[in-house]
Amino acid sequence: SPSGVRLVGGLHRCEGRVEVEQKGQWGTVCDDGWDIKDVAVLCRELGCGAASGTPSGILYEPPAEKEQKVLIQSVSCTGTEDTLAQCEQEEVYDCSHDEDAGASCENPESSFSPVPEGVRLADGPGHCKGRVEVKHQNQWYTVCQTGWSLRAAKVVCRQLGCGRAVLTQKRCNKHAYGRKPIWLSQMSCSGREATLQDCPSGPWGKNTCNHDEDTWVECEDPFDLRLVGGDNLCSGRLEVLHKGVWGSVCDDNWGEKEDQVVCKQLGCGKSLSPSFRDRKCYGPGVGRIWLDNVRCSGEEQSLEQCQHRFWGFHDCTHQEDVAVICSG
């Protein structure tokens, strides 16, 4: 079993090519069967927050040295382990560095933590679409279209945890014009920056832009939900998709209104108001607990529109996972 693990070649210590240490020697891991559950364990072991992807290890520079060995053929984690060493492993059979595994974690230490403070998309439907605004010295500023690119939009979407950029180079509708000072123009992002503030740009506040040139960005925001473990799609333990990872919802404050929003969103009719005992028959989940203290009015069309703690922040165990039973 490996005695150490690290990620090499990424923008920060929480992404990169996976390397493990065996008998004092660092080597790579083959990507046979490498999946998000394996990455989740690795991220947990490194104190890097939630798993966000399983990129190929060859994306990270510099590549593994020819002399460096591939040490592990396959890792099979359930997703609940604390370290990679606790997962089933196969020593290497046949693998080249072209098949090195990679991992990407949220990296809670970075400036694009689950609650980024330096950038927002304002006046849009949800937090993943809107007018780009950047915070500087406690003041929110808009960003001029001049020099804006898809690469810059990618940085914003990643910084907000909103998936890939799907729309940029769009000017705001009149009702969405900013009223803030115009921050800057001539953004020059490579697309690999951790935050928009890391991109080179023109001087702060010095530009000839108008608010009708404010930048509007739309990100994928791949929020989804499902009910698992039931006899049909309309009953079971509730799981929500955030940043490409499925996780459960804690039952703190959960009630009838929250049930109704879930059933509505899934097109599953009305909530059958199950008893506490009925809710528990779907068992505990594994992996992430994404939401806690969800509060809905009952009028929302999506659970995402309800109030809740920041994604991934909770004081729950999987014994408190929410289950919902709808009329179907």
Epitope: K66, S74, S76, E91, V92, Y93, D94, C95
Partner: antibody, heavy 115, light 112 residues
Framework: QSVEESGGRLVTPGTPLTLTCTVS????????INWVRQAPGKGLEWIGM??????TYYASWAKGRFIISRTSSTTVDLKMTSPTIEDTATYFC???????????WGQGTLVTVSS | ELDLTQTPSSVSAAVGGTVTINCQSS????????LSWYQQKPGQPPKLLIY???ALASGVSSRFSGSGSGTEFTLTISDVQCDDAATYYC????????????FGGGTEVEIK
């Protein structure tokens, strides 16, 4: 990419024999090499392998009877320590793994053990 | 150690028909389904048809298909042609504190 077996011949029982697998276009530090045999008119039988990590593995019946070793960056040997008449077969050297699309086999080399 | 039991040991098929060959493993070949199928003709080395239980090897006709997982696997040859006359082997790769490979006993396919 190719693999080729050599060293097969007629030997008497108990006389050690070494077969050699020569590879070209393959980096043995990345790829495993297996030895498989096939007795006349019979099925395929896995003997053992040397992994890309330079570790050897054997079928339980083959332990002690065969020794696999990497002798250079392009050759892997199979030593038959004390052949018996039942070891008469065509011996194949091959790169394969059931989880991979690549499969590369030599034409085989015939070993006949007879007194 | 891994044991693979192949059935039937021989089968006769008409041109245009379908042949099904089964392979049962003594233990699961793991979550990655390390099982492949080979075709061998007399005097030739085996030729890979299917890997990872169901993936078609490069250059192999789509008339060949593989299915199954865990311990039960199947090779299906549809629209059988004269050129399909050969012996077919399943091959499994298994890990248990070490690597093991094994072959099934083979199925001889004869074309009527």
């Amino acid at each position: 990419q190719s693999v080729e077996e050599s060293g097969g011949r007629l030997v008497t029982p108990g006389t050690p024999l070494t077969l050699t697998c020569t590879v070209s276009g393959i980096d043995l530090s990345n790829y495993a090499i297996n030895w498989v045999r096939q007795a006349p008119g019979k099925g395929l039988e896995w003997i053992g392998m040397i992994s890309s990590g330079d570790v050897t593995y054997y079928a339980s019946w083959a332990k002690g009877r065969f020794i696999i070793s990497r002798t250079s960056s392009t050759t892997v040997d199979l030593k038959m320590t004390s052949p018996t008449i039942e070891d008469t077969a065509t011996y194949f050297c091959a790169r394969f793994f059931a989880g991979r699309s690549e499969s590369l086999w030599g034409q085989g080399t015939l070993v006949t053990v007879s007194s | 150690e891994l044991d693979l039991t192949q059935t039937p040991s021989s089968v006769s098929a008409a041109v245009g028909g379908t042949v099904t060959i089964n392979c049962q493993s003594s233990q699961s070949v793991n979550k990655n389904n390390y099982l492949s199928w080979y075709q061998q003709k007399p005097g030739q080395p085996p030729k890979l048809l299917i890997y990872s239980a169901s993936a078609l090897a490069s250059g192999v006709s789509s008339r060949f298909s593989g299915s199954g997982s865990g311990t039960e696997f199947t090779l299906t040859i549809s629209d059988v042609q004269c050129d399909d006359a050969a012996t077919y082997y399943c091959q499994g790769t298994y890990y248990d504190s070490g690597w093991y490979n094994a072959f099934g006993g083979g199925t001889e396919v004869e074309i009527k």
